[in-house]
């Protein structure tokens, strides 16, 4: 049994780190493999993660952790029974993928404005809470070429756009993702999309 592609891990900087790797051939990850992880510096537990299959030769493991701090460093050992397949380390603060924003809501009852709001995926005491910026993707359900990205570089999880910038009588969808500049993170996954109908009509004298 051989590792084809070594484990790579990302942390949500809260409670879960996700490690993925590929094996040299078809593997029943949960039956044959275990990923052990332990904090360096501390008198701490060696934890065991049972991986799941991720395609024929791929495995994925979700490592449960307490809130992450910048100096955390974990040793990682991938075992197949009594055989050590791979040994490595992982510093969560250097490989952060934020959680996806949630509760994306569209408010169209404000005249001439479409207001989008969503929730910051972190509690206020998390280091990422005040560091997230967002990208909002809005697209026309009937015309995928009619798609735009709005970068939200301020902290408040809201975006206002003039309804007049969208086509009237058309259904639109929006989704949002996040990243944290000071932690040099990757983008989060997109939030679930939400749909609304743009009923805005220009005033008669402007037609």
């Amino acid at each position: 049994m051989k590792v084809l592609q070594e484990p790579t891990c990302v942390s949500d900087y809260m409670s879960i780190s996700t490690c993925e790797w590929k094996m040299g051939g078809p593997t029943n990850c949960s039956a044959e493999l275990r990923l052990l992880y332990q904090l360096v510096f501390q008198s701490s537990e060696t934890h065991t993660c049972v991986p799941e299959n991720n395609g024929g030769v791929g495995c994925v493991c979700h490592l449960l952790m307490d809130d992450v701090v910048s100096m955390d460093n974990y040793t990682l050992d991938l075992w197949a029974g009594q055989q050590l397949l791979w040994k490595g380390s992982f510093k969560p603060s250097e490989h952060v993928k934020p959680r996806a924003p949630g509760n994306l809501t569209v408010h169209t009852n404000v005249s001439d404005t479409v207001l989008l709001t969503w929730s910051n995926p972190y509690p206020p005491d998390n280091y990422l809470y005040n560091d997230l910026t967002y990208a909002v993707n809005i697209w026309n359900e009937n015309d995928l070429a009619d798609s735009r990205i709005h970068n939200v570089t301020y902290l408040k999880p809201t975006l206002r756009i003039p309804a007049s910038t969208l086509k009237s009588g058309i259904s639109y969808r929006a989704r949002v993702r996040a990243w944290a500049q000071h932690y040099n993170t990757t983008w989060s996954e997109w939030s679930p999309s939400t749909k609304w109908y743009n009923s805005y009509r220009e005033p008669f004298e402007q037609r």
């Epitope: 537990e45 809130d67 701090v69």
Partner: antibody
Amino acid sequence: EVTLKESGPVLVKPTETLTLTCTVSGFSLTNYGVHWIRQPPGKALEWLGVIWSGGSTDYNAAFKSRLTISKDNSKSQVVLTMTNMDPVDTATYYCARNKGTRPVFDYWGQGTTVTVSS
Amino acid sequence: DIQMTQSPSSLSASVGDRVTITCRASENIYSYLAWYQQKPGKAPKLLIYNAKTLAEGVPSRFSGSGSGTDFTLTISSLQPEDFATYYCQHYVSPLTFGQGTKLEIK
């Protein structure tokens, strides 16, 4: 509900061996480590050692030569054994549950007071 | 071993006061610090870990800050039930506690 309860002798003679039992409920010893901490009268807390969920142990170097921590998962019991007791070992002894990946203590027993005297 | 020094060793304050307790480590412990509250005849209770993360069920008037060697526990508005002894604990192996700060009613 998570609970831990220490039990054992109230009085121990110098040079004797102390055996304390921590009986837990509301969680499994196969999932959590359990620490022992003591507090001499009017003094600060002192970490003695831990037994992890997998059965491995870590000890405070100051007590390593005379301390053993073991457990019986099926009985939900952790046992502390400290040899060659001395009057300076008079203290309240606590067992406490380890919180996740951090060696901090989220649930504690109420403590048992042990006096070492002849 | 890393030594933890708390200050002050005792302090008197009134209900509603803002109180700060400090803990200094003899060497860098990063953010590996916890705070506990202990009332007479009772076991300690975890308040904060990772220097600033509030433990479950702890009121938001408690907050922690600091990293490296200098840390503080702040109680923004003292309540009658907050009068107790407070301990810091680092968890760079081996674990050690501070000597405690006794918070008394003025």
